[in-house]
């Protein structure tokens, strides 16, 4: 049935997607999360709004994606940062911007970086700036693994559904 | 049969790719478009050249990709921009570069941004510049949805098959 | 058996991967390579360490990925570059950074660029810099085709498993 195995919000979407699960008899876990634009100084992932969804077993726990079944997944994320020119009275210090997708697994007592992108920005006078970072790759993951992100430069995020997102799908 | 459901050019390719559809008994819609290098001040997508293709129901209409069947798709695009140094006599104005993949659906009376990347460039004296933008993500799409792009900075595009492209595939 | 086909560290993970090959009765070729951090002035791809892997027929040949069977593949790669400020005594010359995924097939007497990203960097005084490049797309490939990379700016690569990688998977 359409919507079966989906979160409430994704199920709602899927009622309009009658053919969504017909292409494969097997389940195809997939998730696409967007940064919550109402939280300006943090990056909280949401799946119950706009075009975000959790499908076929993906779930969200403590701002992390929980891997529903062992296998190979393509994992991806994007952030866009922006900033204004610095004031002539202030000193311009370089800004370190970074975004990382991390894996937390019962095997390891720490977060393992899977995907990392970095940038140094040097704000100038009268010079607003914008910078985008994207990355994605295939990883062997285990049921129960936690995928999370770490970002340096959160106050500079341009939080919109099309600029800041995080997702994964089973291959 | 090889070539079934392909555009003429892709069908031609697929006749020599007899195994292309054997890995899955179900259809796997996929498309990869490249920017037409002969059109310097616009971004026209082409599927009948180089390594571009439309497979298993994808089609191109009004410079948009038409979604062949409802389901989850990974959608991606890249652009590369370049520019020369500004002349000492000219004033250097900042350049806003942006690239967006948009969804037009009968559900909404407007184009919904799915993927957006942005950059401000400040051309300097004797300083040619280059900038690349890439993004991709998974979306729930409906049969007949239109995927298109919008780009700020089109005159600065480096139009080649490996630098400017737009594609999607069903998961 | 769980753990079969993984690197030693990943094998440990895969003992908890009993379902890894059950999701599809058909084979799903996939590969994820990382840049060898012990080779500082070259970019050598490795699949037998960290989270890198070769699955279901992918193989390496002369630092290239060999396509295991004809079909459509999503191919991706990322690099991160970094540099220090130039010394006041030295002249600052612009740095051309580029990363390209190439296809070698004897059909052509040359490597065909599939994915290209480029950047010009102008190192400044007291200004360390960082730059990330990512790209990926879907291509129709033939059994035995060779996928390789070419990079300008290799001495500036930040070689770690999460920053420099190259991969592909069958759709």
């Amino acid at each position: 049935l359409p919507g079966v195995g989906l979160t409430p919000s994704a199920a709602q979407t899927a009622r309009q997607h009658p053919k969504m699960h017909l292409a494969h008899s097997t389940l195809k876990p997939a998730a696409h999360l967007i940064g919550d634009p109402s939280k300006q100084n943090s990056l909280l992932w949401r799946a119950n709004t706009d075009r975000a969804f959790l499908q076929d077993g993906f779930s969200l726990s403590n701002n992390s994606l929980l891997v529903p079944t062992s296998g190979i997944y393509f994992v991806y994320s994007q952030v866009v940062f922006s900033g204004k020119a610095y004031s002539p009275k202030a000193t311009s210090s370089p800004l370190y911007l970074a975004h990382e997708v991390q894996l937390f697994s019962s095997q390891y007592p720490f977060h393992v970086p899977l995907l990392s992108s970095q940038k140094m920005v040097y704000p100038g006078l009268q010079e607003p700036w914008l910078h985008s970072m994207y990355h994605g790759a295939a990883f062997q993951l285990t049921q129960g693994d936690q995928l999370s992100t770490h970002t340096d430069g959160i106050p500079h995020l341009v939080l919109s559904p099309s600029t800041v997102f995080f997702g994964a799908f089973a291959l | 049969l090889p070539g079934v459901g392909l555009t003429p050019s892709a069908a031609q390719t697929a006749r020599q790719h007899p195994k292309m559809h054997l890995a899955h008994s179900t259809l796997k819609p996929a498309a990869h478009l490249i920017g037409d290098p002969s059109k310097q001040n616009s971004l026209l997508w082409r599927a009948n050249t180089d390594r571009a293709f439309l497979q298993d129901g994808f089609s191109l209409s009004n410079n948009s990709l038409l979604v062949p069947t409802s389901g989850i798709y990974f959608v991606y695009s890249q652009v590369v921009f370049s520019g020369k140094a500004y002349s000492p006599k000219a004033t250097s104005s900042p350049l806003y570069l942006a690239h967006e993949v948009q969804l037009f659906s009968s559900q909404y009376p407007f184009h919904v941004p799915l993927l957006s990347s942005q950059k401000m460039v400040y051309p300097g004296l004797q300083e040619p510049w280059l900038h690349s933008m890439y993004h991709g993500a998974a979306f729930q799409l409906t049969q007949g949805d239109q995927l298109s792009t919008h780009t700020d900075g089109i005159p600065h595009l480096v139009l080649s098959p490996s630098t400017v492209f737009f594609g999607a595939f069903a998961l | 058996l769980p753990g079969v086909g993984l690197t030693p560290s990943a094998a440990q993970t895969a003992r908890q991967h009993p379902k890894m090959h059950l999701a599809h009765s058909t084979l799903k070729p996939a590969a994820h390579l990382i840049g060898d951090p012990s080779k500082q002035n070259s970019l050598l791809w490795r699949a037998n360490t960290d989270r890198a892997f070769l699955q279901d027929g992918f193989s390496l040949s002369n630092n290239s990925l060999l396509v295991p069977t004809s079909g459509i593949y999503f191919v991706y790669s990322q690099v991160v570059f970094s540099g220090k400020a130039y010394s006041p005594k030295a002249t600052s010359s612009p740095l051309y950074l580029a990363h390209e995924v190439q296809l070698f097939s004897s059909q052509y007497p040359f490597h065909v660029p599939l994915l290209s990203s480029q950047k010009m960097v102008y190192p400044g005084l007291q200004e360390p810099w960082l730059h990330s490049m990512y790209h990926g797309a879907a291509f129709q490939l033939t059994q035995g085709d060779q996928l390789s990379t070419h990079t300008d700016g290799i001495p500036h690569l930040v070689l770690s498993p999460s920053t420099v990688f190259f991969g592909a998977f069958a759709l």
């Epitope: - | 007899p18 | 033939t142 035995g144």
Partner: antibody, heavy 118, light 107 residues
């Protein structure tokens, strides 16, 4: 049913040349590469290289580069192994093989014996 | 080139015995190992690919395991038709190399 039939083997003098053929049937010839693998008498197996009939792509074991050339003729559904400057140590049974996935030798011909001797 | 070292080079066993053949790679090869069976005067036959996957039509008594550098082919209950020479092959990187073979003989 996939069938591979080698021919062209025989006795050749050191320094001489020989061309082996592999006639393929039972599948679409351009869909898969053809590998050549050899086995010296009483010894193990050694991969020589492959050719893709679809695009004439080749990949060789470096050991054989320069002396051996692998090619194919789509119109005849046949692959070839051209061997030049043959040495005594090239004496072996030469097999052609068709893979499923590229590095797995799933279908084999019956082999053809090449003897290099004066 | 990657070296594949098989052990033992030969073994004697009886019908119904459990037989284990090992193969060690000179460097880690992920799961990229296949196993073949060859009978005198015949071409080899593919048994196992990707270290543990049985090829189509191969009886379930044949199984493969291992990852990294150490791999095993097991015949759970030896049958008369299993007396042959067995080869491992790495498919991690070219030139793809084979082990020297293990001859399984009747005791």
């Amino acid at each position: 049913e996939v069938q591979l039939v080698e021919s062209g083997g025989g006795l050749v003098q050191p320094g001489g040349s020989l061309r082996l053929s592999c006639a393929a049937s039972g599948y679409t010839f351009t869909s898969y590469v053809i590998h050549w693998v050899r086995q010296a008498p009483g010894k193990g197996l050694e991969w020589v290289g492959y050719n893709n009939p679809y695009n004439d792509g080749t990949n060789y074991n470096e050991k054989f580069k320069g002396r051996f050339t692998i090619s194919s003729d789509k119109s005849k559904n046949t692959a070839y192994l051209q061997m030049n400057s043959l040495r005594a140590e090239d004496t072996a049974v030469y097999y052609c093989s068709r893979p499923t996935m590229l590095p797995w030798f799933a279908y084999w011909g019956q082999g053809t014996l090449v003897t290099v001797s004066s | 080139d990657i070296q594949m070292t098989q052990s033992p080079s030969s073994l004697s066993a009886s019908v119904g015995d459990r037989v284990t053949i090992t193969c060690r790679a000179s460097q880690a090869v992920s799961s990229a190992v296949a196993w073949y069976q060859q009978k005198p005067g015949k071409a080899p036959k593919l048994l196992i690919y990707s270290a543990s996957h049985r090829y189509t039509g191969v009886p379930s008594r044949f199984s493969g395991s291992g990852s990294g550098t150490d791999f095993t082919l097991t015949i759970s209950s030896l049958q008369p038709e299993d007396f042959a020479t067995y080869y491992c092959q790495e498919s991690y990187s070219t030139p793809w190399t084979f082990g020297q073979g293990t001859k399984v003989e009747i005791k």
